[in-house]
Interface confidence: medium
């Protein structure tokens, strides 16, 4: 990268993204790395990380989750169905990643990097998918009202929401990573 061309640290224009399976694999690991930093700050700030899974399950968040029918698990694996699920799930996570943007103090930059890296990952995966018609994009109006609702919660709920988003996103990406390695 020539001196002075490192603005905002988005990849320099000459670097064409490599869209091989390895590239996608590395992109996911990069995002997971960012998530672990955000989780570190969240866990240091609140005791959410110690809360039992059962207690945290009692929430009204509709976070994307892998199910048997999605074809991403070893039993009943279906490449096309699974890829559609991964892309759809990532698109659904975008509103939650937007919510995370104002939730961090020392890791503000990391939150941004996770959000931007996820957008890039979606692009990589869309190039890989053959059946783009099956991918449903979330409704912007619904997303906007969901964002407003999340931001209006009290401090404790916002802390819990942040923790849940990070945990669910991490689990979703880990499942996606395992599935993509079979493709």
């Amino acid at each position: 990268v020539p001196p002075g061309e490192d603005s905002k640290d988005v990849a320099a224009p000459h670097r064409q993204p490599l869209t091989s399976s390895e590239r996608i694999d590395k992109q996911i690991r990069y995002i997971l790395d960012g998530i672990s930093a955000l989780r570190k700050e969240t866990c240091n700030k609140s005791n959410m990380c110690e809360s039992s899974k059962e207690a945290l399950a009692e929430n009204n968040l509709n976070l994307p989750k892998m199910a048997e029918k999605d074809g991403c698990f070893q039993s009943g694996f279906n490449e096309e169905t699974c890829l559609v699920k991964i892309i759809t799930g990532l698109l659904e996570f975008e509103v939650y990643l937007e919510y995370l943007q104002n939730r961090f103090e020392s890791s503000e930059e990391q939150a941004r990097a996770v959000q931007m890296s996820t957008k890039v990952l979606i692009q990589f995966l869309q190039k890989k998918a053959k059946n783009l018609d099956a991918i449903t994009t979330p409704d912007p109006t619904t997303n906007a009202s969901l964002l407003t609702k999340l931001q209006a919660q009290n401090q404790w709920l916002q802390d819990m929401t942040t923790h849940l988003i990070l945990r669910s996103f991490k689990e979703f990406l880990q499942s996606s990573l395992r599935a993509l390695r079979q493709m």
Epitope: V1, P3, D6, D9, V10, A11, A12, R15, P17, L18, S20, S21, E22, R23, K26, Q27, Y30, D33, G34, S36, A37, L38, K40, S107, E109, Q110, A113, M116, S117, V120
Partner: antibody, heavy 123, light 104 residues
Framework: QVQLVESGGGLVQPGGSLRLSCAAS????????MTWVRQAPGKGLEWVSS????????AYADSVKGRFTISRDNAKNTLYLQMNSLKSEDTAVYYC????????????????WGQGTQVTVSS | DIQLTQSPSSLSASLGDRVTITCQAS??????LSWYQQKPGQTPKLLIY???RLQTGVPARFSGSGSGTSFTLTISGLEAEDLATYYC?????????FGSGTRL
């Protein structure tokens, strides 16, 4: 302008310790994976250790595992290499390099290198 | 661990020649390979990343190819300033590793 400046090298006796530092500027340090590479006199390049951007996950060459520790301080834009139980075969120029950077993961190619700091292990 | 075997270890060529350096990986590394040039007394410089992508500012006479286990760096039309040692690096899986170098 991207700059990587290593310091902390010097002459040390076998079994001794040194801490190398690499001051980074001209880019958002916290977004980049960083790596130490070394080069023994008249020899080739040897990958020593890498550290992830955010989580601080690390990896080491077998030759330094258990003796060297890579770390970073994103607030200070600084990369470190703590070298303990030094051996004569650790004598080399140590380079700090930037890799796998920015929001788009492209490759681990090391696009910027510091000038290097000399470490000499001798009695 | 992945080993990289670089050949030849040294080579002599004339100005204008087409020069080929190869790097063989002990297992598949996809296209996760980069090439570096190190001139005497200087720090290494990235030439090629992702096996075949030319880094900005690197002359077009340099090119990289290959995937899996076999990779090639080609200099078409050797120039005096290309006198250097060339290294390949696999960054597919930790521990990363360099080839032993080719002195030109």
């Amino acid at each position: 302008q991207v700059q990587l400046v290593e310091s902390g090298g010097g002459l040390v006796q076998p079994g001794g310790s040194l801490r190398l530092s690499c001051a980074a500027s001209g880019f958002t340090f916290s977004n980049y994976y960083m790596t130490w590479v070394r080069q023994a006199p008249g020899k080739g390049l040897e990958w020593v250790s890498s550290i992830y951007s955010f989580s601080g996950d690390t990896a080491y060459a077998d030759s330094v595992k258990g003796r060297f520790t890579i770390s970073r301080d994103n607030a200070k834009n600084t990369l470190y290499l703590q070298m303990n139980s030094l051996k004569s075969e650790d004598t080399a120029v140590y380079y700090c390099t930037r890799n796998l950077g920015g929001v788009v993961v492209t490759t681990n190619g090391y696009d910027y290198w510091g000038q290097g700091t000399q470490v000499t292990v001798s009695s | 661990d992945i080993q990289l075997t670089q050949s030849p270890s040294s080579l002599s060529a004339s100005l204008g020649d087409r020069v080929t350096i190869t790097c063989q990986a002990s297992q598949s590394i996809s296209t996760e390979l980069s090439w570096y040039q190190q001139k005497p007394g200087q720090t290494p410089k990235l030439l090629i990343y992702g096996a075949s992508r030319l880094q900005t500012g690197v002359p077009a006479r340099f090119s990289g190819s290959g995937s899996g286990t076999s990779f090639t760096l080609t200099i078409s039309g050797l120039e005096a300033e290309d006198l250097a040692t060339y290294y390949c690096l696999q960054d597919y899986s930790w521990p990363y590793s360099f080839g032993s170098g080719t002195r030109l």
